[in-house]
């Protein structure tokens, strides 16, 4: 859960109570037990550009 009074994390990141900052959800592939990864499961991934129409 994000700490009160902090700015919301950008898309593709999630709040880490253990570090008191937003962390990149991409790192959860390598280390899924990080505390912020629970928030990543509920959040959509960062937008990406399609390589085809």
């Amino acid at each position: 859960e994000q700490a009160p009074g902090t700015a919301p994390c950008s898309r593709g990141s999630s709040w880490s109570a253990d570090l008191d900052k937003c962390m990149d959800c991409a790192s959860c592939r390598a280390r899924p037990k990080s505390d912020f990864c629970l928030g990543c499961a509920a959040a959509p991934p960062a937008p990406f550009r399609l390589l085809w129409p």
Epitope: S16, D18, L19, D20, S27, R31, K33, S34, D35, F36
Partner: antibody
């Protein structure tokens, strides 16, 4: 120069309490996670406890859970470890260490340690 | 908890020798592996983080390699000040970080 200086160790009877302190200097203390690690005489390193930069999140090894409490005072640049219900197996040198700014990745600076002896 | 096993537990070597210490994790820890050096009566000192990254100020004769479950710390040419105990530490299974039992490097 980064410095971490532990204090508060000593001889205590089983069941007793001690409060360790770790005074930080040479860096801005508040953004860094901190931890305590201990080393029993002649033995290896054992992680004891972790605290987030704000102090809002804490973690403990199973061996000390419910008996030890980690805290910090960022205005005083100081880390604490309150140790209650001490046992003979808690006898060790206790080190404080500074975490990196990524997730639990490494601990780059350590204090010189303070010896806690639990004995009757 | 993830168990970290170092080998050998001790070794004897001479100045100038190439020394290799291994650390094995009980399950894959990716590259979340650090190495520390500890001299008698002193605090541990970070040597290598993220399996192969040299900590600032550490001599280049120290190097680390490996990923998954098997890791190696190598001292390319042992110096008198390198006689110490070396510990590996995993930071994958947080917050329950664990250390290896240590490898003592002694003078032959």
């Amino acid at each position: 120069e980064v410095q971490l200086l532990e204090s508060g160790g000593g001889l205590v009877q089983p069941g007793g309490s001690l409060r360790l302190s770790c005074a930080a200097s040479g860096f801005t203390f508040s953004p860094y996670p901190m931890m305590w690690v201990r080393q029993a005489p002649g033995k290896g390193l054992e992680w004891v406890s972790y605290i987030s930069p704000s102090g809002g999140s804490t973690h403990y090894a199973d061996s000390v859970k419910g008996r030890f409490t980690i805290s910090r005072d960022n205005s005083k640049n100081t880390l604490y470890l309150q140790m209650n219900s001490l046992r003979a197996e808690d006898t060790a040198v206790y080190y404080c260490a500074r975490g990196g700014d990524t997730y639990f990745d490494y601990f780059d600076y350590w204090g010189q340690g303070t010896l806690v002896t639990v004995s009757s | 908890d993830i168990q970290m096993t170092q080998s050998p537990s001790s070794l004897s070597a001479s100045v100038g020798d190439r020394v290799t210490i291994t650390c094995r994790a009980s399950q894959s820890i990716s590259s979340y592996l650090n190495w520390y050096q500890q001299k008698p009566g002193k605090a541990p000192k970070l040597l290598i983080y993220a399996a192969s990254s040299l900590q600032s100020g550490v001599p280049s004769r120290f190097s680390g390699s490996g990923s998954g479950t098997d890791f190696t710390l190598t001292i390319s040419s042992l110096q008198p000040e390198d006689f110490a105990t070396y510990y590996c530490q995993q930071s994958y299974s947080t917050p329950g970080i664990t250390f290896g039992q240590g490898t003592k490097v002694e003078i032959k």
